[in-house]
Interface confidence: medium
Amino acid sequence: VPQKPTVSLNPPWNRIFKGENVTLTCNGSNFFEVSSMKWFHNGSLSEVANSSWNIVNADFEDSGEYKCQHQQFDDSEPVHLEVFSDWLLLQASAEVVMEGQPLFLRCHSWRNWDVYKVIYYKDGEALKYWYENHNISITNATVEDSGTYYCTGKLWQLDCESEPLNITVIKAQHDKYWLQ
């Protein structure tokens, strides 16, 4: 069975601000021949032929679907990158999470300016409050953690809020044939 490579992001967020940097890495076993690596952005073949693609000073055109391909393997699953202009941006380790997996949320500010009085909300209800900015960590996500999240905070003297982000936690699929 052909293996699928996977694309990882560093930093690990798929929602970033305009002007930020992110590195996409094509991970897979025994990718010795770097020259046979291919990257696709929104279905178009890129000139990048390395196992990593560095996006520097991200712009809106960098948004979209990224895939990598190695000649001996299937295409990777797509990774979606979204570039925003705003004051606060709610970032998540994943927007679709398997039950039992961890989920991390980060209330990220434009240019990493200091944010105070940070409140995370889920479905309109305040979830957590910190005077200084902190991330939210859910060790074992459950279906009840699904919902619409956003964060608010003070940037300088101004009240700011992020756009909402839908998080879906799905039950782990147990293949009924896996024991056979």
Partner: antibody, heavy 120, light 108 residues
């Protein structure tokens, strides 16, 4: 300056799909959120939903099951589809721009609106 | 949903009058409150954003105030072109974004 222009049929039959397009001129569709709002005759304003240039959407929960908003960045257009329409969907439909900078979060530019009547 | 309630629903006033329209949110919306003016057959026009900031090109006789749940739009000296319907709108994150029911300002 930036202008928005709605286009689409003015008459739609019940149970069919209402389709409208908003063309943005004088600015790139990037960097903003693009909105659909409607106003039934003699009534107030109702937010239908928005789309970001990258394709992220957010819909009014009361219409979510029937609405799709899409964007064509290369054409500088975004579109509204409202399925299974009834007479209650008869309204003036406006497209608008939402500015997220300077803590505006307001609809600062509007199209002139297009009247859609649902009738057999 | 966050409910926005405007008062009064309609108002008669004369040129030169000082007019105040209020808007109340069913929960705190910080300062995410905007005001629009709509004339018959026209699209709404943004007057005030973020509760108190005047949109570019809008006459200074319009002003906004408030935070949390209670907001006010004031027209310091009514002009003939100000007779219209006014809407408040909250733009807080939880969908849906909602408008007040409108205040119709008529000539006395």
């Amino acid at each position: 300056q930036v202008q928005l222009q709605e286009s689409g049929p003015g008459l739609v039959k019940p149970s069919e799909t209402l389709s409208l397009t908003c063309t943005v001129s004088g600015d790139s569709i990037s960097d903003y959120y693009w909105i659909w709002i409607r106003q039934p005759p003699g009534k107030g304003l109702e937010w239908i939903g928005y789309i970001y240039y990258s394709g992220s959407t957010n819909y009014n929960p009361s219409l979510k099951s029937r609405v799709t908003i899409s964007v064509a960045t290369s054409k500088n257009q975004f579109s509204l589809k409202l399925r299974s329409v009834t007479a209650a969907d008869t309204a003036m439909y406006y497209c608008a721009r939402r500015n997220n900078w300077n803590h505006v979060r307001a609809f600062d530019i509007w199209g002139q609106g297009t009247m859609v009547t649902v009738s057999s | 949903d966050i409910q926005m309630t405007q008062s009064p629903s309609s108002l008669s006033a004369s040129v030169g009058d000082r007019v105040t329209i209020t808007c109340r949110a069913s929960q705190s919306i910080s300062s995410y409150l905007n005001w629009y003016q709509q004339k018959p057959g026209k699209a709404p026009k943004l007057l005030i954003y973020a509760a108190s900031s005047l949109q570019s090109g809008v006459p200074s006789r319009f002003s906004g105030s408030g935070s949390g749940t209670d907001f006010t739009l004031t027209i310091s000296s009514l002009q003939p072109e100000d007779f219209a319907t006014y809407y408040c709108q909250q733009s807080y994150s939880t969908p849906p974004i909602t408008f007040g029911q409108g205040t119709r300002l008529e000539i006395k």
